[in-house]
Each structure stands twice: as C-alpha cells, then as structure tokens.
Interface confidence: low
C-alpha cells in the first residue's frame, strides 16, 4: 500500500529545556542531559538502583493531547545495563521495564494522583531490550514501538515503571498513524486516520480527479491500522476528450488536433481524415468544410463527402416508356452506401423557353424511383409525344447533411406515339334472336386520335371468331343465332396501331319466339 504518514503528539528529542516529568519516589528516575546517536543534545531519564531490592520507581510524562486519535504509538529509545556485568548486586536486578498509560479529560495528575500502580494506570507491555551492555561497552541503543487504544478522553499520560534495572530512557515519541492522501484509479482519497485497533479498516470515500468520471461505485479505499491503503472499491476513468497522465493521477485534455471519443484509459488519437479540432479536450473531431459524418458513423470514422454526379446516363425510349442506365460516380465521397434517385420532369413549350414540372403520380418506376442500388430503371406510363427531363441523383449517407441538393446527371427525351390503351368496359344495349347492340367507353389513354375500333366475337360453343370494324364506339352484330352465348372483345386503333383487346365479355341472344328486341342492363366484364 501507500506509505503511512506519522504525526507526532509528543517527542522528547526536540526538547532541550527540562522535561520536568513527575517521578515517584524522588530517589528513582532522574533527569539528565545526554546525546542521541546523531550527537544531538537531548534530555534523558535514568534509573540504576540495582543494589537495593524491591524497587518500584515510576516516571510519568506531562499531559499529551489526543487530537481525536483512537490509537497511539509510542517509540522508546533506551539502553539497559547487563545485570551480569554489575558486581555485588542482589538477584532482584532486572533488564526490563513496564510501559503504562492513563487517560484523562484534562491535565489533572499530581505527585500522588493517580495512584502509582497498575489500575488506574493501564499496562501496555513489559519492554525488554534486544541488547544490554556491560561496563566495558558503549551503550547499545534499543528502539521499541508499542501501541494502545482505543482512546476516548481528551488526552493521556505515559508512565514508566522500573523494578530494579540500570537503564537510561533516551527518547520517547508518542505519535499516531494516518493514510496519506492518495490518488488511485483516477480517484482522490483524503488523508485518513487509522482506526482504534491494529486490524481496523477505516473507509475513506473517494472523488474522481478532475476530468474523470465514475465507472463503478461506491468509490472507497480502506485505511488499515498501519496507515496503509488497501482494498480499493470502485474506480474512475478519464472522461471523453482526456487521456491518462502522470501514472493515473491526472486526466490530461487531448491537445488540439487529437480527440478521444470514449471514456477510458486509452490515449488521445490524431483526428481521422478530413476532420480537425481547434481546441483541447475534444471528444470528436469536427469535419472540414463540405465533409460530414452520417448519424450512424462513429466518432472514430473519417469525415466523408457527397458523391459526384453519376456518369454516362443512357436512355432507351420505346413509345411511352424508357430504360435509363448510368455508371457509378467518379468520386464516391469516401463512402460505400451509395444510392440513386431518379427525378422525372415533364416539359411544356418549345426549345429553350420550355417550362418543366414534376411528372404525374401515375408514372411508374421499376424497381423504384428513390433509393436505387442498381444503375438501371424502367419508366412507363409516360404521355406520347411529350418531352421529359430525367435527373439521376447520386446520394450517400451524408447527402442529408449537405446544405446543397444532391448532384445529378440529366437526360432529355421525347416519347413516341404509343398504341391506345385497352377499352375498359362493354355494355349491352339490346338483344334479339339474331342481333346484339353493344357500346363501350373509349380507352383511358388513347395516345392520339382513334381511327376506328375492331370487334372480335364468336359463339361460345363454336369458338370460330368473326371481326367487324366500327368508327363509332357502338356496333350492332347481326346474323347471330338465337338463344346463343357470344364472347366479344374490342380494341381501338390509332396511327400507332391497335391497342390491346378488352377483356372478354359474354352476351346472349334471345329466342326467336321472343317479342322484339329485349333491353338488357349493362353487363360488366366477368
């Protein structure tokens, strides 16, 4: 984990005046000047009443304010004389001492209170040296760290009990540990005090660093009893337009000319072709003039443009229909979603003075008029002897983004005379034993002047056809058999030739015994 911070509550190392701690009895611990291992002047306490048995010498520090800390650490530096190196001493010589503390809400202690004994003082530990020394050695300094808690009052005293050692207390430092403010996973966690126990885990809530966003919540880090961070929960990541820097402690804006479309730990990338950024922290690069992105294009894709016009439009006119064919545009604009639209305009008037307007809705385009993928269309139901302009537009996924209309190639054509369309309906006006009088509506699209009509009829049971011609849109068929069913079809003729026959219609003659011509209702084709 991250290195722990230690904050000092009290340290004798930096005190050069008298410590003036309380000792009991007065013949026990004694304050003297000395030097630490770096030869700095320090105040120490010594005791060496080894020649007398039943020693019980206490030393108490001044009041130490707690500062909301729950667990306190004490670092002791001391030397202890080896009992075996001291001649003529009783067996009560010790090489250990005891560490205690006492909590209070203010500096209430006196020479006699609290009583100099375990309870009210709370024992922390018996402190033994790693090395003791003989008279011939230089004093070997031992360092021990002990901790205690949880603390709840405003402050505390430390106390040291000697029971017959020859020792020197060189320095005492009371401190607490905290986890230093840190950045992890693009989140910032504040300085956090350790908990009451060495095993405590204190939760520190996190906040995303600038230009980062949460990717999993909650954001928290645990501060353990040693002042080290552990078990990160949740994470942040760099926002769009920002890339990681300084070992995940910063999210740096993308420099101009680069972008980052997605949040995450990826780097900023150079702008795709035909795009740019002019300011930092771009999540998308804006397209150059006349270049665009379709709504379905990702921010990572290049900007593209509209296609150039289709090339080589060829028309093949057949009476009132035609086939248009063309080639792919020279420039597809960098896209592969090319489509074609065919715009039909009917022109009136002669030469350059002609005015053109949109074609009627009945003009038919096969396979369709708009959104063609193929480069061919069949157009029918045009008017005869009429001038038309057809515009073949090339469009792609960004044509809708362009302020300009699609680019097109145009072709002008004039339709030929077409044969008339089919005669729609036949009506029976009267019938007798030997005749039928019929009429019909002219074709919907005569496509010119109708010269005459040709009627084909036959008796249904025989199937041998006869034809008659009429310049009117009615005819009387004579010389028919009574009580017979006839099948009749009519077609119109213009200078362009005959049109299609009408659908077959059936009519009956009456019996010869019937009185005169019988008026029948109109019969529609079956």
């Amino acid at each position: 984990g991250c290195r722990a911070l230690e904050e000092t509550l009290m340290d004798t190392k930096w005190v050069t005046s008298e410590l003036a701690w309380t000792s009991h009895p007065e013949s026990g611990w004694e304050e003297v000047s000395g030097y630490d291992e770096a030869m700095n002047p320090i105040r120490t306490y010594q005791v060496c009443n080894v020649r007398e048995s039943s020693q019980n010498n206490w030393l108490r520090t001044g009041f130490i304010w707690r500062r909301d800390v729950q667990r306190v650490y004490v670092e002791l530096k001391f030397t202890v004389r080896d009992c075996n190196s001291i001649p003529n001493i009783p067996g009560s010589c010790k090489e250990t001492f005891n560490l205690f503390y006492y909590e209070a809400d203010s500096d209430v202690a006196s020479a006699s209170s609290p009583f100099w004994m375990e309870n009210p003082y709370v024992k922390v530990d018996t402190i033994a040296p790693d090395e003791s020394f003989s008279r011939l050695d230089a004093g070997r300094v031992n360092t021990k760290v002990r901790s205690f808690g949880p603390l709840s009052k405003a402050g505390f005293y430390l106390a040291f009990q000697d029971q017959g050692a020859c020792m020197s207390l060189i320095s005492v430092r009371a401190f607490y540990k905290k986890c230093a403010s840190t950045t992890a996973g693009f989140a910032l966690f504040p300085e956090t005090l350790t908990g009451a126990e060495p095993t405590s885990l204190v939760i520190a809530p996190g906040t995303c660093i600038p230009n980062a966003v949460e990717v999993s919540v909650p954001l928290k880090l645990y501060c353990n009893g040693d002042g080290e961070w552990m078990v990160p929960v949740g994470a942040c990541t760099c926002a769009t337009g920002h890339e990681p820097a300084a070992k995940e402690s910063q999210c740096r804006p993308c420099p101009p000319g680069s972008y980052k479309a997605k949040q995450g730990e990826g780097p900023c990338l150079p702008c795709p072709p035909n795009s740019r950024t002019t300011s930092p922290a771009a999540s998308i690069c804006t397209c150059h003039n006349n270049f665009y992105r379709a709504d379905s294009d990702s921010a990572d894709s290049a900007c593209t443009t509209v296609p150039s016009p289709p090339r080589g439009v060829i028309s093949n006119v057949n009476e009132t229909s035609l086939i248009l064919e063309w080639s792919e545009p020279r420039d597809l604009g960098g896209r592969d979603d090319l489509l074609y639209n065919v715009i039909c305009k009917k022109c009136h008037g002669a030469g350059g003075a002609s005015a053109c307007s949109r074609c009627d809705d009945n003009v038919e385009f096969v396979p369709r008029q708009l959104g063609l993928t193929e480069r061919r269309v069949h157009i029918s139901h045009l008017l005869a002897h009429t001038r038309y302009t057809f515009e073949v537009q090339a469009v792609n996924g960004v044509s809708g983004k362009s302020p300009l209309p699609p680019r097109y190639a145009a072709v002008n054509i004039t339709t030929n005379q077409a044969a008339p369309s089919e005669v729609p309906t036949l009506r029976l006006h009267s019938s007798s034993g030997s005749s039928l009088t019929l009429s019909w509506a002219p074709p919907e699209r005569p496509n010119g002047v109708i010269l005459d009509y040709e009627m084909k009829y036959f008796e249904k049971s025989e199937g041998i056809a006869s034809t008659v011609t009429s310049q009117m849109n009615s005819v009387q068929l004579d010389g028919l058999r009574p009580d017979a069913r006839y099948v009749v079809q009519v077609r119109a003729r213009t200078v362009a030739g005959y049109g299609q026959y009408s659908r077959p219609a059936e009519f009956e003659t009456t019996s010869e015994r019937g009185s005169g011509a019988q008026q029948l209702q109109e019969q529609l084709p079956l």
Epitope: G257, K262, L269, C271, P273, R276, D297, S298, G334, R335
Partner: antibody, heavy 113, light 108 residues
Framework: QVQVQQPGAELVKPGASVKLSCRAS????????MHWVKQRPGQGLEWIGN????????NYNEKFKSKATLTVDKSSNTAYMQLSSLTSEDSAVYYC??????WGQGTTLTVSS | EIVLTQSPTTMAASPGEKITITCSAS???????LHWYQQKPGFSPKLLIY???NLASGVPARFSGSGSGTSYSLTIGTMEAEDVATYYC?????????FGAGTKLELK
C-alpha cells in the same frame, strides 16, 4: 497486448484473385480504421486504402481503386483485402495497420505461374 | 495528392553522431498529421514519432521530431548501432495518405 495478425505468405497465379486477411485482438476492433499498405521488395510504402470496421465505410487510393476491395467481418474482428486480376506487379508485402501505430507482420504475396 | 520528399535518401553515420532527416511536403499540412516510422529489414514499420514531436511508447529519448507547414525533421541525438534502419515520414492530412520514399540509415 495488442496484436494484429496476418498470414505469412500467399502464392497465386497471374490473372487470379486473392483475399488477404488481418485479424485484430485485444482492443476495440471497431474503434480504429484498418489501413492497408503495400511494399514492393526494396521499395517504399504505398497506402492502398482504409476501412471503417464499425460500418464498412472505405477510402481508397485512386491508384488501387480497381485493384483492391476492402471489407470487414466484425464478428471475427477481421479485415480483408481482395486483390483482383493479379500480375507480377502485385507481388509485394501487404501490411495491415490500425491506429494508433499497431502494424501486422505483413503477408508476402507472390504472383507467379 | 500530397507528395512527401525525404532527404537524404541514404546516409552513413558513426555511433555517437547526431543525425537529422528532413521531410518536405508538397503542400502545407498541420503538424498534427505528420508521423515518422522506423523499419528494420524483414520487419514491419514501427511508429516512432506521432503528431510531429510526440515519442511513441517505448521509443528512446534520443529520438525527437519537429517542424511545421511544409518542413519537418527527425533527429537522433546520438546515433546507436541499433538505429540502423529505414525511416519514413507519413502524412494523414488528406486522402490518399502518403509516405516519404524513405531514408536508409547505415553504420559508417
């Protein structure tokens, strides 16, 4: 570790077609254009074109427009380049490369009868 | 099409020498779109410097790039034996993307 994998070599006859593959792993395939680059023996680098793996959109160097067709298969994280009507001039190492700076090892194409 | 002209075409240098390769564009390009590649024989090109002056990941600090408009350069502060390679500049300003013809750097 980002990897862009290409087959080592292809041997084809003149007039035939070949489809070179380029498989990308361990990064978002659809996030970056896939570029194709040609290098003739002892020569420099020529950009053929690129393809957008997210929608199949392409850009071509005019010089290679009738020679190369670029496609992608998103399901397998693979980009393809089809080269048609092959001649000895098409014998080269073909690299695929993805932004930002990941290159395949190249496929050596030999056109020979 | 933007044409990139590199010079010199080939050069030989001793270890410790300072090397400069130039790349001239036929029309002005943004410094964000000029990149340098290193290619060793038998290997694919490796991105060396992107956006004119940014070192790609893992590239030694002896390499540096600079330039603007139509004039760009790649510098090797102190040549090392492992720098023997062909160096290409590349523009990404407009399609088609183009490369310089390359500068072959040899050991003297």
């Amino acid at each position: 570790q980002v990897q862009v994998q290409q087959p080592g070599a292809e041997l084809v006859k003149p007039g035939a077609s070949v489809k070179l593959s380029c498989r990308a792993s361990d990064y978002t395939f659809t996030s970056y254009w896939m570029h194709w680059v040609k290098q003739r023996p002892g020569q420099g680098l020529e950009w053929i074109g690129n393809v957008n793996p997210s929608n199949g959109g392409t850009n071509y160097n005019e010089k290679f427009k009738s020679k190369a067709t670029l496609t992608v298969d998103k399901s397998s994280n693979t980009a393809y380049m089809q080269l048609s009507s092959l001649t000895s001039e098409d014998s080269a190492v073909y690299y695929c490369a993805s932004n930002p700076g990941y290159w395949g090892q190249g496929t050596t194409l030999t056109v020979s009868s | 099409e933007i044409v990139l002209t590199q010079s010199p075409t080939t050069m030989a240098a001793s270890p410790g020498e300072k090397i400069t390769i130039t790349c001239s564009a036929s029309s002005s390009i943004s410094s964000n779109y000029l990149h340098w590649y290193q290619q060793k024989p038998g290997f694919s090109p490796k991105l060396l410097i992107y956006r004119t002056s940014n070192l790609a990941s893992g590239v030694p600090a002896r390499f540096s790039g600079s330039g603007s408009g139509t004039s760009y350069s790649l510098t090797i502060g102190t040549m090392e034996a492992e720098d023997v390679a062909t160096y290409y500049c590349q523009q990404g300003s407009s399609i088609p993307l183009t490369f310089g013809a390359g500068t072959k750097l040899e050991l003297k």
